[in-house]
């Protein structure tokens, strides 16, 4: 984090959002593959 | 002295847009850093608005925000933007910019009144 | 939508004495305890007083703590000083992929009896 300015509370917090949004993203593409395929 | 600074507010019209700065000194800002900012309208708590990532500039918004504002930065400059437009008399408020909301800014007041 | 509820609103208190101040949130805050606490007096931004439910933050004396995770969460002050009355603000994170990523709760004015 900056500095050692602030927590690494936040950052931890949203690298879980991200790789939360990451997931489904692709959990998602994959859905709409299978979807397609059918 | 690690500090945020918010300036751009004042007195706008109803339908009317504002830019509202937040500049960081006293750090560098990092990957890891978000820029969040938050108001308070007179008399009343706290509202968050939205944050942005300063590494990727990813950003998400309070769902009432409804697109009239955006959120923006500028890495080689260490500060983050407010873009209100289509302004009402309820958005008149102090507008905070607050890194990782742990550290705040002074806040800068924003009337909207004709 | 996120309902974040602070009680009380008001709180008249003297010095020394013990104060809890109460979060309640729906829905659950992420992973239980990514909650945070605020301090504002007036004209003045919020101080960053507890983050993740319970830990202080750099710099806030030891006689303000906090506890609870999921949906319920309590501010304490051991013994209120001179300088602890103020407003007092709790700030749940969310998962953002369903909700808001933040919402604050009302306020608590702690104000002299």
């Known amino acids: 984090h900056s500095d050692g300015i602030f927590t690494d509370s936040y950052s931890r917090y949203r690298k879980q959002m991200a790789v939360k949004k990451y997931l489904a993203a692709v959990l998602g593409k994959r859905y709409k593959q299978r979807v397609k395929n059918k | 002295e690690v500090q945020l600074v918010e300036s751009g507010g004042g007195l706008v019209q109803p339908g009317g847009s504002l830019r509202l700065s937040c500049a960081a000194s006293?750090?560098?800002?990092?990957?890891?850093?978000?820029i969040c900012w938050v108001r308070q309208a007179p008399g009343k708590g706290l509202e968050w608005i939205g944050c942005?990532?300063?590494?990727?500039?990813?950003?998400d918004y309070a769902n009432w925000v409804n697109g009239r504002f955006t959120i923006s930065r500028d890495i080689s400059k260490n500060t983050g933007y407010l873009q209100m437009n289509s302004l009402r008399a309820e958005d008149t408020a102090v507008y905070y910019c607050?890194?990782?909301?742990?550290?705040w800014g002074q806040g800068t007041l924003v009337t909207v009144s004709s | 939508d996120i309902q974040m509820t602070q009680s009380p609103s008001t709180l008249s208190a003297s010095v020394g004495d013990r104060v809890t101040i109460t979060c309640q949130s729906s829905?659950?805050?992420?992973?239980?305890?990514?909650l945070s606490w605020y301090q504002q007096k007036p004209g003045k931004a919020p101080k960053f007083l507890i983050y993740?439910?319970?830990k202080l933050a750099s710099g806030v004396p030891s006689r303000f703590s906090g506890s609870g995770s999921g949906t319920e969460f309590t501010l304490t002050i051991s013994s209120l000083q001179p300088d602890d009355f103020a407003t007092y603000y709790c700030?749940?994170?969310?998962?953002?992929?369903?909700?808001?990523?933040?919402?604050f709760g009302g306020g608590t004015k702690v104000e002299i009896k």
């Open positions: 607050a890194g990782n909301l742990e550290i």
């Open positions: 942005i990532s300063a590494g990727g500039g990813s950003t």
């Open positions: 700030l749940g994170f969310y998962d953002c992929s369903s909700v808001d990523c933040h919402a």
């Open positions: 829905p659950s805050i992420y992973s239980g305890a990514f």
């Open positions: 993740e439910a319970s």
């Open positions: 006293g750090f560098t800002v990092s990957r890891d850093y978000w």
